[in-house]
């Protein structure tokens, strides 16, 4: 196999008895993406697969970047919070049991939720065989794979390969269509010697040799262009050091009252379980760990406040206190922990060292192609397509990996709008109620009438504003029974949610500023009722009073208007959103400084922003009754997050509104919190922390959609599968490995 050139088969070349291509899912634990480029010459077989087949620059692991959570994510398409295997070690207060890799408890089906690939295949009439895979020797939903091997790490790799080849030799009626294969290397060697070590190099040669044996065995059976093979890893690997340790004893006078899952992705819970599990004061722990040292190498979070892109909160097994640790550092209880040096993983899945490999080859896959990175939650849908079966519900976005396939099996389409919109019409230029708002600049009713008349756009003006400010179409509302209307202005368009009494979204385009002349002075101390929205559906300005710790923010920033007069279009109740005063500082800095920077760098950006309500922190928009539970004696619900989606043209010679090809996206989902303690901003100007904070909360457009019930880019003329690629793209700015 190795000596031959890449075969370019237009259709599957399967021998007699193989009606449809088998699928082999092959995992090499801890094979970080960088190894593939640094040591390619030492891995001729894997390198040939990379050259001849399709590969991604890397595949993103889910957080925490550990073995069991990611292997099970790969075969279910679910986030760890959804499938339940949230770490290699965990406690479930409802089961009152501990899960670990060294105990038989791991084979208790109660830990394993979701539907793994082997069951999806079996439920649809196919056989499945697993040569090791986390979960494969557990009776999930009462069933095991058709063929499985009890885990035994001492079985030589060659023996594993020859067994799998024997399975492929089984009579057609007994032969599986789906296979898994698992190697512990290069992870074991990476832990022992670190990622840059002779041990890893040796391990890479060993796994490459075994992989070559598989490919040679397939060739002997004339299956090398029949089998669809996916070679991937669960996560990467990074170096750790014994002088890069954070000890909890440096932060607490005593530590015996809590239990800590130590390492690169630490969690803290009560020591006395189950008794103290729910009464444990997690908030106090986070307070005591926040902004304690100038060079602190972890950030403490309550899990609902973690970046939403992590999807690591909604599970009782995920302890409320979470430490987000710096690259190559470890957080542990005390100096008695000497488990350092060598390699480790579990860190932030955006770190380049945590990136995993993804390569694929076979009749269904494109050849000699490199694709952009994607997340491992997408692999399950891809495997279902390869097997031509229906996936179980999962967190992947079906169709987003269609560009890997020669002929896609599943053709996605845009979601149908669930709640239709109306237009909030202009009836009277004078408000029937002031809504307790005031504007000292408008001294009489004639002036008020004048500025309100500006809200009454002609059809031509509406068409013009839509073209510029909604270049990819308005966001469609996928939530049920959401009464909302469109509000058109010359410089922005918004979708107003009547039940929430606030805009659901606001869309506007910031041009590349040709001149650097300052924006006109803003008229911030002025607010008035929007005459197009009935008072019963509007916010009252008196909602924003001091003892609520909440101030008014503008979703569309009034200062973005180029003239003082047009600012009045934004100084209206329909543009108001509730914001914590400290949050608003960050929000205002983003819009007045960072947004202009982005627009300048990208030849203009389209901005869509809005509130998010995710009180139950499940990553999905809350039902109205869930939000109502959190109304603190007020008519206006306080968002848990705000989103901002920046879209520009990939080809920077085009503006967003005239973009013929691919788009570039930069979405943010910023937790709406009363303080900025996450950034330790004391004594620091905004320039030193706001951008970093926004960057920490970058997300995918898809994450925004799930949290808002909105659907974006429906009017962008581009195949839906390409739009899905855009929506599942996560921008990253990590440069060092």
């Amino acid at each position: 196999w190795l000596e031959e050139n890449c075969d370019t088969a237009q259709q599957s070349q399967c021998p007699e008895g193989f009606d449809l291509p088998p699928v082999i899912l092959f995992s090499m634990d801890g094979f970080r993406a960088e190894y593939l480029y640094t040591w390619d010459t030492l891995m001729p077989n894997i390198n040939k697969l990379k050259t001849c087949g399709i590969h991604s620059k890397y595949m993103r692991a889910m957080y925490p970047t550990k073995t069991f959570p990611n292997h099970y994510t790969i075969v279910t398409g679910l986030y760890p919070e959804s499938h339940g295997i949230i770490d290699n070690n965990m406690y479930d207060v409802n089961l009152n049991k501990n899960f670990s890799l060294s105990s038989k408890e791991q084979n208790n089906p109660a830990w394993w939720h979701g539907q793994p690939m082997w069951l999806t295949a079996m439920y649809q009439g196919l056989k499945a065989a697993t040569y090791f895979w986390p979960g494969s020797e557990v009776a999930i939903n009462g069933s095991f794979p058709s063929i499985y091997m009890p885990y035994n790490g001492s079985v030589p790799f060659e023996e594993r390969i020859s067994t799998l080849l024997k399975w492929l030799d089984l009579p057609k009626a007994e032969r599986p269509r789906f296979y898994t294969m698992y190697f512990e290397e290069p992870d074991s060697s990476g832990h022992a010697g670190g990622p840059v070590s002779a041990r890893v190099i040796k391990a890479l040669q060993v796994v490459d040799h075994a992989f070559g044996m598989l490919m040679e065995g397939l060739k002997q059976r004339n299956l090398h262009n029949c089998v669809n093979i996916i070679l991937l890893a669960d996560h990467g690997m990074d170096q750790t050091y014994c002088n890069k340790m954070e000890y909890m004893t440096d932060y607490f006078p005593r530590i015996n009252f809590f239990y800590m899952y130590e390492g690169p992705a630490p969690r803290i819970r009560a020591h006395n379980i189950p008794h103290d599990f729910f009464s444990f004061n997690s908030e106090e722990i986070v307070r005591n760990l926040s902004c304690r040292k100038p060079d602190q190498h972890f950030k403490p979070y309550l899990t609902p406040d973690l970046p939403k892109r992590l999807h690591y909160a909604k599970n009782v097994r995920i302890d409320k206190v979470h430490l987000f640790v710096d690259q190559q550092w470890l957080a542990v209880r005390s100096k008695s922990n000497t488990n350092c040096g060598g390699g480790n993983h579990g860190y932030n899945n955006e770190f380049r060292s945590m990136e995993a490999i993804f390569l694929a080859h076979g009749p269904s896959f494109k050849e000699k192609t490199e694709v952009e990175p994607f997340e491992n939650i997408e692999v399950y849908n891809l495997m279902c397509d390869l097997l031509r079966i229906q996936p179980a519900p999962n967190n992947g976005t079906h169709g987003s990996l269609n560009h890997l396939l020669k002929v896609p099996f599943y053709e996605p389409s845009h979601a149908e709008e669930v709640s239709k919109f109306s237009v909030c019409g202009f009836a009277n230029p004078l408000p029937t109620e002031s809504l307790d708002c005031f504007c000292p600049h408008l001294q009489n009713s004639t002036q008020l009438e004048q500025v309100n008349q500006m809200l009454n756009l002609t059809q031509e003006e509406i068409t013009a504003t839509v073209k510029v400010n909604l270049p990819f179409g308005r966001p469609r509302v996928l939530q049920k029974n959401v009464d909302h209307c469109l509000l058109y202005h010359r410089e922005y368009v918004s979708g107003f949610g009547k039940a929430m009494r606030m805009p659901m979204w606001s869309s506007y385009t910031v041009p590349q500023l040709g001149d650097t002349s300052p924006l006109p002075p803003t008229v911030p101390d002025c607010l008035r009722a929007d005459v197009r929205v009935p008072p019963s559906e509007s916010q009252k300005c008196s909602f924003y009073l001091a003892d609520k710790n909440i101030t008014h923010g503008f979703l569309y920033p009034p200062a973005s208007n180029r003239t003082s007069d047009s600012q009045y279009d934004a100084l209206i109740t329909s543009n108001l959103v509730p914001m914590y005063e400290e949050f608003r500082k960050m929000w205002d800095y983003f819009h007045s400084v960072l947004l202009i920077k982005h627009a300048t760098e990208r030849n203009g950006v389209n901005v869509v922003s809005g509130p998010i309500f995710d009180y139950n922190y499940d990553g999905h928009f809350d039902a109205p009754d869930e939000i109502t539970k959190h109304l603190a004696n007020t008519d206006v619900p306080i968002p848990t997050h705000y989103f901002v989606v920046l879209t520009s043209c990939k080809n920077k010679s085009h503006t967003p509104e005239n973009c013929p090809g691919w788009l570039d996206v930069l979405p943010f989902i910023i937790p709406h919190r009363p303080t900025n303690v996450e950034s330790c901003p004391e004594g620091k100007p905004e320039a030193l922390w706001v951008e970093e904070r926004f960057t920490a909360h970058i997300a995918r457009v898809r994450d925004v959609e799930l949290l808002t019930g909105l659907d974006f880019y429906q009017d962008k003329v581009q195949p839906v599968s390409e739009i899905l690629q855009l929506k599942t793209y996560l921008p990253t700015f990590e440069t060092t490995i």
Epitope: S434, D436, H441, P524, D525, S542, D547
Partner: antibody, heavy 121, light 110 residues
Framework: EVQLVESGPGLVKPSETLSLTCTVS??????????WGWIRQPPGKGLEWIGS???????YHNPSLKSRVIISVDTSKNQFSLKLSSVTAADTAVYYC?????????????WGQGTLVTVSS | QSVLTQPPSASGTPGQRATISCSGS????????VNWYQQVPGTAPKLLIY???QRPSGVPDRFSGSKSGTSASLAISGLQSEDEADYYC???????????FGGGTKLTVL
Amino acid sequence: EVQLVESGPGLVKPSETLSLTCTVSGGSISSSSYYWGWIRQPPGKGLEWIGSMYYSGSTYHNPSLKSRVIISVDTSKNQFSLKLSSVTAADTAVYYCARHYITVAGIFDYWGQGTLVTVSS
Amino acid sequence: QSVLTQPPSASGTPGQRATISCSGSSTNIGSTIVNWYQQVPGTAPKLLIYSNNQRPSGVPDRFSGSKSGTSASLAISGLQSEDEADYYCAAWDASLNGPVFGGGTKLTVL
């Protein structure tokens, strides 16, 4: 807890300019959420609003006093000031500085303790 | 002459209920919210009721406010001796383009 403290001379001669300063602590005068205002109360009488200002410098005043009033801000010192020119005996009052929420008319939630200014020769 | 009209005095015995009225016009009370302030002699006024009927934190629920048309009223139930003070109503006046106050009502607890 926000605190406001008025300071300035307690005695001003007729036709001169009354100058008072209000120092804010426990909160920033540069907050985008508040106006900072002056109110006065002649002895044994009711309250009268003089004028208010926003940290950016925009101000508005009681029309009956407007031509005589200047309100200014010094964000670096977290202070704002009142100047009332051409004073007469009718301007004798306790002068209060206060904070009110930007979006809502005239809800003064925090007040200084007040300073008595007597206009007399 | 104050823009908003209040009775100069009101009284009640401990435990009783007292009511203070405030009358304005369409340019003030009729088109916006009413706020009430309490001023104990020798001290600064304190916000007692805002937005017609909302109490800032720390104000007992014995104090309540209401508004109807161009008039408003403050009610104090279960009068206590410490309630003895001057009470001022206030509202934004659109024609003045600023806040206006009532002349104040001196409440005596007998």
